[in-house]
């Protein structure tokens, strides 16, 4: 297993609709034809997998059906979007990139993106 540098933004603020997007960029030492991207969430020293996708030559990442993630790729950049976030989902989201093929296998883990989620205030009742 060889190490690889992965860069991602330090902080992202989710939209009022609970959507957060960030770019995960990896320094590929060669031309990988098969890449696996995993988003991990770290909160209270616990790490959980949020979503993962393996992609090849296309520009759209395909996630499992119950995934809250969507994404696209362009060169060595992956544009990730996480949806359905609530205040309790605030945490550090880490991008993990694996170059699956061709050998050698490379693994890179980013420093994480702190995503802040603020639940929208409920609209006050109106008399109109």
């Amino acid at each position: 297993c060889k190490a690889m540098h992965v860069a991602q933004p330090a902080v992202v603020l989710a939209s009022s609709r609970g959507i957060a997007s960030f770019v995960c960029e990896y320094a590929s030492p060669g031309k990988a034809t098969e890449v696996r991207v995993t988003v991990l969430r770290q909160a209270d020293s616990q790490v959980t997998e949020v979503c993962a996708a393996t992609y090849m030559m296309g520009n759209e990442l395909t996630f499992l059906d119950d995934s809250i993630c969507t994404g696209t790729s362009s060169g060595n950049q992956v544009n990730l979007t996480i949806q359905g976030l609530r205040a309790m989902d605030t945490g550090l989201y880490i991008c993990k990139v694996e170059l699956m093929y061709p050998p050698p296998y490379y693994l890179g883990i980013g420093n994480g993106t702190q995503i802040y989620v603020i639940d929208p205030e409920p609209c006050p009742d109106s008399d109109f």
């Epitope: 090849m56 030559m57 759209e60 699956m100």
Partner: antibody, heavy 115, light 106 residues
Framework: QVQLVQSGAEVVKPGASVKVSCKAS????????INWVKQAPGQGLEWMGR????????YYNEMFTGRVTLTRDTSTSTAYMELSSLRSEDTAVYFC????????WGQGTMVTVSS | DIQLTQSPSFLSASVGDRVTITCSAS?????IHWYQQKPGKAPKLLIY???TLASGVPSRFSGSGSGTEYTLTISSLQPEDFATYYC?????????FGQGTKLEIK
Amino acid sequence: QVQLVQSGAEVVKPGASVKVSCKASGYTFTSYWINWVKQAPGQGLEWMGRIAPGSGTTYYNEMFTGRVTLTRDTSTSTAYMELSSLRSEDTAVYFCARGDYFDYWGQGTMVTVSS
Amino acid sequence: DIQLTQSPSFLSASVGDRVTITCSASKSVSYIHWYQQKPGKAPKLLIYDTSTLASGVPSRFSGSGSGTEYTLTISSLQPEDFATYYCQQRTTYPLTFGQGTKLEIK
């Protein structure tokens, strides 16, 4: 030029298995997914699963999980789809298709399940 | 699973007509891809990533849309366009196709 050439038609008995091959040429086999698509007579298209020929990573449609197995042989640039426990509703044409965009397709393999 | 519903399922039109086929997704998808299939043949990629024409596809074909609503438009039907058209999504597994739209000669 890119080509996907599939094996010939099969007639199989209920409960048996069938293995369909898809030989790729004209491109780097390990650079693109190989997808498998079912089309029953007079019906639409149904994605069965895909394999990344380099690593062998597979994704399956749950409707076929447990009955379909996707494999590949990189030395011959050939992908295989094996379907087991066959029943009459498996009678269909099975296509292989290349990549994320399904930009090249095999000619199709007719599988008839009949006693 | 993401369901794709095409409308109409059947369409009768004449050479020279402008026709539009709609593909509605049960959940928002990033892109839609379109295929054409003629009887006894394998499907053929027409449009990928919603609006990009595949190699060799005539410019009378176009695609548009976003979110859950997508369309395929043929600006002026030619005799060779009479076929069945399918939309497809690959935002989430399993990849799914629409049920198809059969375009027939009026």
